[in-house]
């Protein structure tokens, strides 16, 4: 009896694992084996596919074959007993195009109100993704074990921290990788669960803000308790994207080590141009808080957001304020590359009652003032871009007296 060729051959490639599956054509014939050949583009001869010769099952693995994953290959299969079937040719394919990204490896660390997720590719030193290793991004689905309500987080890198969680609560998550450059979305990892710890005695510092004063950066934060010491650390933001890096070498800011106030001042030259992450930790001598949420700090934006410089022309019932570019040292104006909005605060010198004006224009009228009265004015700039959402510190207050009653024109 003639053996029939196997049918319905499927090629599954996940990372560097190459699996072939097929259907027997004739279930009634026993003791049949199957063998594959392969052919590279531009070659006439067929080569035996190692790992897929004389196979008794309907599945084989040819991962050991060292292929150029960007080169098209063709496969053929036949059945063998005493005689052999005709060859069945599988549609040619390029391994890289066919490959799926496997489930990533996930490692979790717990704090009281946060979880740190470390993600790495499921296959170490993968041949398939050798040129794309730095391009992986990840997405995850997280839920409270008790509720099952899922939250999706997209476009994260090899280390991600999720904040604002509840203490002593089990959270579960699964992660998948993507190569957006190749339009590839991977397979989810198994579900990983971790319980957040009991609430820490000391909360982390909050509301960290960076501003510029003179040639210094001023870092401020809020803290619940008094008599604490704080330390501040920084990290190059790009290091978060490096998939091979599991040790994040956070560095101390020397002027911000063991400070006893909720702010510290350090020279601008501590940081070269770039984007950094900053974090703050509190200690009372016995206990230490977890680290604060990490804030992104862009020296370009920060340096540019100096408080505005302004001139006041005084009338009897109003001030005309003319806002100019802030001056750097050496009295050169700072180039403003971003659209700004200005917040102007003014008050009567003898009163604490402040009034506020928000303006996009650089010439602003402050109306409804009393004649022959001293008013003080300070201003700050805000970026209009929501993503940056930066504010300068307030300028120093400038105080001027309004003119007598007949000079309103």
């Amino acid at each position: 009896k003639n053996l029939k060729s196997p049918q319905k051959v499927e090629v599954d490639i996940i990372d560097d694992n190459f699996i072939l599956r097929w259907n027997r054509s004739d279930e009634s014939v026993g003791n049949v084996t199957f063998s594959f050949d392969y052919q590279k583009t531009g070659m006439d001869n067929w080569i035996k596919l190692s790992g897929c010769q004389n196979i008794t099952s309907t599945k084989c693995n040819f991962s050991s074959l060292k292929l150029n994953v960007y080169e098209e290959i063709k496969l053929r299969i036949r059945a063998e007993k005493e005689n052999t079937s005709s060859w069945y040719e599988v549609d040619s394919f390029t391994p890289f195009r066919k490959a799926q990204i496997g489930p990533p490896e996930v490692h979790l660390e717990a704090e009281d109100k946060a979880i740190v997720i470390h993600i790495s590719p499921g296959t170490k030193d993968s041949v398939m993704w050798a040129l794309d290793g730095l391009s992986f991004t990840y997405s995850l689905v997280i839920w409270k074990n008790s509720s099952g309500v899922e939250e999706r987080i997209e476009n994260i890198y090899s280390r991600h921290k999720i904040y604002k969680l509840s203490p002593e609560t089990t959270y579960c998550l699964k992660v998948k990788a993507a190569l957006l450059t190749s339009w590839k979305i991977g397979v989810y990892s198994p579900v990983h669960c971790i319980k957040t710890t009991v609430e820490n005695e000391l909360p982390p510092p909050e509301n960290i803000e960076v501003s510029v004063q003179n040639q210094n950066y001023v870092l401020k934060w809020d803290y619940t308790y008094a008599n604490m010491t704080f330390q501040v650390q920084w990290l190059h933001a790009f290091l978060k994207r490096n998939p091979g890096n599991h040790l994040y070498k956070w560095k101390q800011i020397p002027d911000c080590e063991n400070v006893k106030t909720t702010q510290c001042v350090f020279p601008q030259n501590v940081f070269q141009k770039g984007i950094y992450l900053l974090r703050v930790q509190a200690s009372d001598g016995n206990n230490t808080s977890f680290w604060s949420e990490e804030i992104k700090f862009d020296t370009e934006i920060q340096a540019f957001l100096l408080p505005p410089v302004f001139n006041i022309r005084s009338l009897s019932d109003s001030f005309h304020i003319y806002i100019g570019a802030p001056k750097q040292s050496g009295n050169t104006p700072v180039i403003q590359d971003y659209p700004l909005i200005y917040e102007i605060i003014f008050w009567e010198n003898t009163s604490n009652a402040e009034r506020k004006i928000i303006e996009k224009k650089t010439d602003v009228t402050v109306p409804n003032l009393k004649p022959l009265t001293v008013y003080c004015v300070k201003a700050r700039a805000h970026t209009m871009d929501e993503k940056l959402n930066k504010s300068s510190v307030f300028s120093d207050a400038v105080c001027e007296k309004t003119k007598p009653g007949n000079t309103s024109k």
Epitope: H118, I194, V198, L247, F290
Partner: antibody, heavy 118, light 107 residues
């Protein structure tokens, strides 16, 4: 494979100094921290300090601050521990270990016995 | 400094026994705890990191659990080669510290 090989045993007089080495192979020392730990005979482990070989930043346990100095030479993948003003209770085994982020201290050297005796 | 206590300080057990060693820290250290095994005259061997993750090559009979201030190392079925001293270690904040050790010997 990853290995940390420490220098041989040392015998020193009280008040002297000793410099121990720890050579890493099978990994780039700049990508890790190297830690030093001491162990007195029959006692537990005690952390001395660590170095980031990439920029020579160090941290020390308060007890060893000023008496221990950790350095590194990345060109030969080696970290060093120098102990000054040796006392008889410094007769201990010193271990170096590789620290790898959340993987903590994953590999250890074989240890160096320092004997301080007059 | 973060203090670490271990209990028991020593225990006698037989091959096949389930052994549990506990470690307490003086403050919340999240999951930044590792466990080491040490045999006389040898360097410590790393068993567990981040509270519950086994290093590659460590047998599955070793497991770790806990978080915050209370941590446990469990050996599900004690083998002859497991008789040693076990140390816990916190790497949450400097100075890093170790527990005093738990000696596991043959009953």
């Amino acid at each position: 494979q990853v290995q940390l090989v420490q220098s041989g045993a040392e015998v020193k007089k009280p008040g002297a100094s000793v410099k121990l080495s720890c050579k890493g192979s099978g990994f780039n020392i700049k990508d890790y921290y190297i830690h030093w730990v001491k162990q007195a005979p029959g006692q537990g482990l005690e952390w001395i300090g660590r170095i980031d070989p990439e920029d020579a930043e160090t941290k020390y346990a308060p007890k060893f601050q000023g008496r221990a100095t950790i350095t590194a030479d990345t060109s030969i993948s080696t970290a060093y521990l120098e102990l000054s003003r040796l006392r008889s209770d410094d007769t201990v085994v010193y271990y170096c270990g590789r620290y790898h982020g959340y993987w903590a201290l994953d590999y250890w050297g074989q240890g160096t016995l320092v004997t301080v005796s007059s | 400094d973060i203090q670490m206590t271990q209990s028991p300080s020593s225990l006698s057990a037989s091959v096949g026994d389930r052994v549990t060693i506990t470690c307490k820290t003086s403050q919340n250290v999240g999951t930044n705890v590792a466990w080491f095994q040490q045999k006389p005259g040898k360097a410590p061997k790393s068993l567990i990191y981040s509270t519950s993750y086994r290093y590659s090559g460590v047998p599955s009979r070793f497991s770790g659990s806990g978080s915050g201030t209370d941590f446990t190392l469990t050996i599900s079925s004690l083998q002859p080669e497991d008789f040693a001293t076990y140390y816990c270690h916190q790497y949450f904040s400097y100075p890093y510290t170790f527990g005093p050790g738990t000696k596991v010997d043959i009953k």
